[in-house]
Interface confidence: low
């Protein structure tokens, strides 16, 4: 079968890193600089991705593989293959359309990316708050109130400003 296919289509014999050049009697020509073909039998080479601006080159383009980008310091990748770079915020903040904003009371973010998430509600598990939450850290739940000595109190946070997982608009 392979043999028949090769006879019908000489281009199927062109390896990765080349293209089947119809202008030159279907000879396999090397991909020109700044282009690549990652599979055999291609009639054109693909233009290499250019990592410009906020993107920086993580892996150079070669004749057989595309360049790979990541983000300059202060930004992080989003999307498949780092298709976008999003600004980092500090821990205790989230990125909104107006820039980095502190997490509302009752929520936290322990990373430089993503949104503020509500503190764990210890009372849902019948536990008490052992360590209060901050903008950067979740609460630490301790033993249930019944296990505490008399006079101990627990802190229950107010309801969060929005539902968990809701993206900022």
């Amino acid at each position: 079968f392979e043999r028949t296919r090769s006879l019908q289509d000489p281009c199927s014999n062109c390896p990765a890193g080349t293209f089947c050049d119809n202008n030159r009697n279907q000879i396999c020509s090397p991909c020109p600089p700044n282009s690549f073909s990652s599979a055999g039998g291609q009639r054109t080479c693909d233009i290499c991705r250019q990592c410009k601006g906020v993107f920086r080159t993580r892996k150079e383009c070669s004749s057989t593989s595309n360049a790979e980008c990541d983000c300059t310091p202060g930004f992080h990748c989003l999307g498949a293959g780092c298709s976008m770079c999003e600004q980092d915020c500090k821990q205790g903040q989230e990125l909104t359309k107006k820039g980095c904003k502190d997490c509302c009371f009752g929520t936290f973010n322990d990373q430089k990316r993503g949104i503020c998430r509500p503190w764990t509600n210890c009372s849902l598990d019948g536990k008490s708050v052992l360590v209060n939450g901050t903008k950067e850290r979740d609460v630490v739940c301790g033993p249930s109130p019944a296990d505490l000595s008399p006079g101990a109190s627990s802190v229950t946070p107010p309801a969060p400003a929005r539902e968990p997982g809701h993206s900022p608009q």
Epitope: N13, P15, P32, P33, N34, G40
Partner: antibody, heavy 116, light 107 residues
């Protein structure tokens, strides 16, 4: 007529560096990747790396990455390979070549002899 | 790294005989294999690319076959001028690698 011109021979001392040149003519210089290949006397071929003649991007065989540096001077249509910290194991013929599939062009090779 | 193993290391043939050279890849390289002829004191010259395509100007007594891991170069009727080393090489993945060569001598 595509030609890749290389000097015939270089004699260098152990521990020193050598800069090999490859001057291209007869085609649009930046149209291809330039590869460098090593051949020790009586032995097979060993790929060192390639350079994108348009933007200087490089890919190296890990084994040579720390000691080989590929560069290009577009104004003179010349590709260069610098090889550093030479030992007797580096005594070989070094070819510049437009290697990937067809067309295929090879320089005549530069014989590098490492000797005190 | 993909290792290309050529056999035999050397062979001695009479003019007019059929010659078969083998090249085995340690991993699948598709058809991204080339064969090169290197005559004494010369640089290599491309014979076959894409496993089976004869390069421009190469006599039709040279034939390449194979895919994946097993490749063969056949010279249907060897001539005196075919005295040379023959190298196979893969351009399927980095680093590109070559076999150690087969030396063809003419009796």
């Amino acid at each position: 007529q595509v030609q890749l011109q290389q000097p015939g021979a270089e004699l260098v001392k152990p521990g020193a560096s050598v800069m090999l040149s490859c001057k291209a003519s007869g085609y649009t210089f930046t149209s291809y990747w330039m590869h460098w290949v090593k051949q020790r006397p009586g032995q097979g071929l060993e790929w060192i790396g390639e350079i994108n003649l348009r933007n200087g991007g490089t890919n190296y065989y890990e084994k040579f990455k720390t000691r080989a540096t590929l560069t290009v001077d577009k104004s003179s249509s010349t590709a260069y390979m610098q090889l550093s910290s030479l030992t007797s194991e580096d005594s070989a013929v070094y070819y510049c070549t437009i290697l990937t599939s067809a067309p295929s062009y090879w320089g005549q090779g530069t014989l590098v002899t490492v000797s005190a | 790294n993909i290792v290309m193993t050529q056999s035999p290391k050397s062979m001695s043939m009479s003019v007019g005989e059929r010659v078969t050279l083998s090249c085995k890849a340690s991993d699948n390289v598709g058809i991204s294999v080339s064969w090169y002829q290197q005559k004494p004191e010369q640089s290599p010259k491309l014979l076959i690319y894409g496993a089976s395509n004869r390069y421009t100007g190469v006599p039709d007594r040279f034939t390449g076959t194979g895919s994946a891991t097993d490749f063969t170069l056949t010279i249907s009727s060897v001539q005196a001028e075919d005295l040379a080393d023959y190298h196979c090489g893969q351009s399927y993945s980095y680093p590109f690698t070559f076999g150690s060569g087969t030396k063809l001598e003419i009796k």
